[in-house]
């Protein structure tokens, strides 16, 4: 079958990294610079992906494979195949339309991406606050006052003063 197919279609003999050049009697020509063909028998080469701006070249384009991009440091991938890059923020911040903003009082973000989330409400589980929350960390809940042995007391540190106005990164 392969032999039959190659007799019928001379282009099937063209390997990856080449294309079947109709302008040159269907001779296999190498892919031009900045293009590639990842399979044999192709009549055109595909243009290489270019990694610019927020995108970083992780793997260069070759005659047989496309370039691979990820995000330049300070940004992180979003979408299938890293189709988009979003700016990192510091821990304790979230990305808004106006850039990175500090988490509001009562919320935290322990990552460089994502949104600020409310501190855990320990009292909903009948527990007390063992360690206060910050912009970067959730509160740590301790045992409920009833769980403590007689004579022991649950020390709940005072909540920190309200943060000053938000400032961009």
């Amino acid at each position: 079958f392969e032999r039959t197919r190659s007799l019928q279609d001379p282009c099937s003999n063209c390997p990856a990294g080449t294309f079947c050049d109709n302008n040159r009697n269907q001779i296999c020509s190498p892919c031009p610079p900045n293009s590639f063909s990842s399979a044999g028998g192709q009549r055109t080469c595909d243009i290489c992906r270019q990694c610019k701006g927020v995108f970083r070249t992780r793997k260069e384009c070759s005659s047989t494979s496309n370039a691979e991009c990820d995000c330049t440091p300070g940004f992180h991938c979003l979408g299938a195949g890293c189709s988009m890059c979003e700016q990192d923020c510091k821990q304790g911040q979230e990305l808004t339309k106006k850039g990175c903003k500090d988490c509001c009082f009562g919320t935290f973000n322990d990552q460089k991406r994502g949104i600020c989330r409310p501190w855990t409400n320990c009292s909903l589980d009948g527990k007390s606050v063992l360690v206060n929350g910050t912009k970067e960390r959730d509160v740590v809940c301790g045992p409920s006052p009833a769980d403590l042995s007689p004579g022991a007391s649950s020390v709940t540190p005072p909540a920190p003063a309200r943060e000053p106005g938000h400032s961009p990164q």
Partner: antibody, heavy 118, light 111 residues
Framework: QVTLKESGPGILQPSQTLSLTCSFS??????????VGWIRQPSGKGLEWLAH???????RYNPALKSRLTISKDTSSSQVFLKIASVDTADTATYYC??????????WGQGTLVTVSA | DIVLTQSPDSLAVSLGQRATISCRAS??????????MHWYQQKPGQPPKLLIY???NLESGIPARFSGSGSRTDFTLTINVVEADDVATYYC?????????FGGGTKLEIK
Amino acid sequence: QVTLKESGPGILQPSQTLSLTCSFSGFSLSTSGMGVGWIRQPSGKGLEWLAHIWWDDVKRYNPALKSRLTISKDTSSSQVFLKIASVDTADTATYYCAQMTSSVFAYWGQGTLVTVSA
Amino acid sequence: DIVLTQSPDSLAVSLGQRATISCRASESVDSYGHSFMHWYQQKPGQPPKLLIYRASNLESGIPARFSGSGSRTDFTLTINVVEADDVATYYCHQSYEEPWTFGGGTKLEIK
């Protein structure tokens, strides 16, 4: 405190290979997002980017010089190396290495002067 | 390659006055709302020093009299109240596209 220091041969002859070393402290090339780049500056002239290497060993070269350049790193000894093959008098310059974060050269070494002379 | 053209080549400013340096790119250096244009200061006999990154972000430890603005192809470095210590050559740099390139430099002197 981030510091970088370049070292090289000082003088070499045309057609030889230039070997440069960048020794750094205050950061690690095993840290995600970190990189080290090389830039050169002929006396009294402007700056030219040569190459850089990222924490994950992704290497990038100036296409105009790519065939002559090789960049590498030794993470454990906090060093980055640049080799330039077949040097010519046009390669006479001060060579800088710089710490890279988010595609900018954040901290620079003092530079090392390289003279190519017959 | 992206060509960066700085103007003027040199300027003389009186102490306390404002200095403005322009950098024009041969094509846009913007990506996803970020401009990949940066500014460096180089004093005689010293390596360059980062002042501004991504067009308008002041690098840590740099005095607030330095500021950057612009987008796409046109960028400006402004020194609001020039001091004697600001005598240097200033370079713009794009990291939008390889090869990364630098402007030719602008030499700032005191009048």
